[in-house]
């Protein structure tokens, strides 16, 4: 004969465990039903009655099958340097990630504890490695024949336009200026951008920074100490 299916609550056989989505209640000494995600145990089981579950209240959640007496509180609202990438529901906690232009310098189990603004590359320098969710921007000097005239965390060095006749030669922070005759090859207008970190790319993107009005001779200055390598701000 096939074994009978026991309905909760039931006393487990000695040495056996309760089935999936059940738990052993020490007080009742019975296998009882767990509550589904989005619910919690309102009344624990007894020898004769199963667990009574109830829905989580607003701003609380349970993500797993459980028998907790109270749902967990969702995390606080996302801060001004973050965007909400997962809303607080009865079944999941809110997740905040750093907004565009920022990276997570200190992670927590889900989301980010502390966001920091990405470094920017000054005129004469372009982005060598873009910022990611968890790493800062790395800049590099623009090589001969390329330039960047912006202070930006996304702009890379781009080629000088090639002129028939050069009026002003380009340098690391300025494009070449051609005489009134049109250049033989002109780059597409506007700066070349690197994408923002994937998780926030579609969220609240900010306008492209305008070119800095600072003098564009910074690349001529003697180089100071090397900037920290990517990731060196982490512990």
């Amino acid at each position: 004969l096939p074994a009978q299916v026991a309905f909760t609550p039931y006393a487990p056989e000695p040495g056996s465990t309760c089935r999936l989505r059940e738990y052993y209640d020490q007080t009742a000494q019975m296998c009882c039903s767990k509550c589904s995600p989005g619910q919690h145990a309102k009344v624990f089981c007894t020898k004769t009655s199963d667990t009574v579950c109830d829905s989580c209240e607003d701003s609380t959640y349970t993500q797993l099958w459980n028998w907790v007496p109270e749902c967990l509180s969702c995390g606080s609202r996302c801060s001004s340097d973050q965007v909400e990438t997962q809303a607080c529901t009865r079944e999941q906690n809110r997740i905040c990630t750093c907004r565009p232009g920022w990276y997570c310098a200190l992670s927590k189990q889900e989301g980010c504890r502390l966001c920091a603004p990405l470094r920017k590359c000054r005129p004469g320098f372009g982005v060598a490695r873009p910022g990611t969710e968890t790493s800062d921007v790395v800049c590099k000097p623009c090589a001969p024949g390329t330039f960047s005239n912006t202070t930006s965390s996304t702009d890379i060095c781009r080629p000088h336009q090639i002129c028939n006749v050069v009026a002003i030669p380009g340098n690391a922070s300025m494009d070449a200026v051609c005489t009134s005759t049109s250049p033989t090859r002109s780059m597409a207008p506007g700066a070349v951008h690197l994408p923002q970190p994937v998780s926030t790319r579609s969220q609240h993107t900010q306008p492209t920074p305008e070119p800095s009005t600072a003098p564009s001779t910074s690349f001529l200055l003697p180089m100071g100490p090397s900037p920290p390598a990517e990731g060196s701000t982490g512990d």
């Epitope: 801060s79 001004s80 340097d81 973050q82 232009g101 310098a105 200190l106 504890r113 502390l114 966001c115 920091a116 603004p117 990405l118 470094r119 920017k120 590359c121 000054r122 004469g124 320098f125 800049c139 590099k140 000097p141 202070t151 930006s152 900010q206 306008p207 920074p209 305008e210 070119p211 800095s212 009005t213 600072a214 910074s218 690349f219 180089m223 100071g224 100490p225 090397s226 900037p227 920290p228 060196s232 701000t233 982490g234 512990d235």
Partner: antibody, heavy 121, light 110 residues
Framework: QSVEESGGRLVTPGTPLTLTCTVS????????INWVRQAPGKGLEWIGI?????ITNFANWAKGRFTISKTSTTVDLKIASPTTEDTATYFC??????????????????WGPGTLVTVSS | ALVMTQTPASVEADVGGTVTINCQAS??????LAWYQQKPGQRPKLLIY???ILTSGVSSRFKGSGSGTEYTLTINGVQCADAATYYC????????????FGGGTEVVVK
């Protein structure tokens, strides 16, 4: 590249006051601006920041007491209802130190000379 | 709230001596820490950023170190011109910040 505060004066408690930070040599669409104050004989106290995109954030104690706004070349700090405890020198400071091809937005440089606000009845 | 605790509040040093100022964050700040010098009646001056990088024009007698929650400013070969108040500052201006600055340390040179 410089910043300079103005608008500091003697006011009576409860009289709204607006301080202005005027920037030159750089763009407010590239750099954040912080407001910091220093009561006589006391330490530096961060009030808040306006980011390049116009978003503002404030120290816990300053929320609701101050607002920050900006134009293309100025940043205003409004003290909604000053009390005698708001007597201090108010500084604006750019969020962003330029070095080695980088702008480090977490360091404050340059600073303005400060403007003195005295709140007294 | 993220809080910076700076010690000592005041320190005396002999010319040529060494001064050590400590700054403790209530949680890790991942090296996003700066040090400032302020003399009476003047604006603060940035000395060190990212915990250990000296700004241009600042004497190599100043040294920043530390990581995680513990940071230190060391002034070697103290000179009379070093008499000032020094402040640490963390680089987070997001939510739940009480003050980005430590309480300050007054350095008195004898």
């Amino acid at each position: 590249q410089s910043v300079e505060e103005s608008g500091g004066r003697l006011v009576t408690p409860g009289t709204p006051l607006t301080l202005t930070c005027t920037v030159s040599g750089f763009s407010l669409s590239t750099y954040d601006i912080n407001w910091v104050r220093q009561a006589p004989g006391k330490g530096l106290e961060w009030i808040g920041i306006i980011y390049t995109g116009g978003i503002t954030n404030f120290a816990n104690w300053a929320k609701g007491r101050f607002t920050i706004s900006k134009t293309s070349t100025t940043v205003d700090l409004k003290i909604a209802s000053p009390t005698t405890e708001d007597t201090a020198t108010y500084f604006c400071a750019r969020g962003g130190y330029d070095s080695d091809g980088y702008v480090y937005p977490d360091a404050f440089d340059p600073w303005g000379p400060g403007t003195l606000v005295t709140v007294s009845s | 709230a993220l809080v910076m605790t700076q010690t000592p509040a005041s320190v005396e040093a002999d010319v040529g001596g060494t001064v050590t100022i400590n700054c403790q964050a209530s949680e890790s700040i991942s090296n996003l820490l700066a040090w400032y010098q302020q003399k009476p009646g003047q604006r603060p001056k940035l000395l060190i950023y990212r915990a250990s990088i000296l700004t241009s024009g600042v004497s190599s007698r100043f040294k920043g170190s530390g990581s995680g929650t513990e940071y230190t400013l060391t002034i070697n070969g103290v000179q009379c011109a070093d008499a000032a108040t020094y402040y640490c500052q963390h680089g987070y201006t997001g939510t739940n910040v009480q003050n980005v600055f430590g309480g300050g340390t007054e350095v008195v040179v004898k």
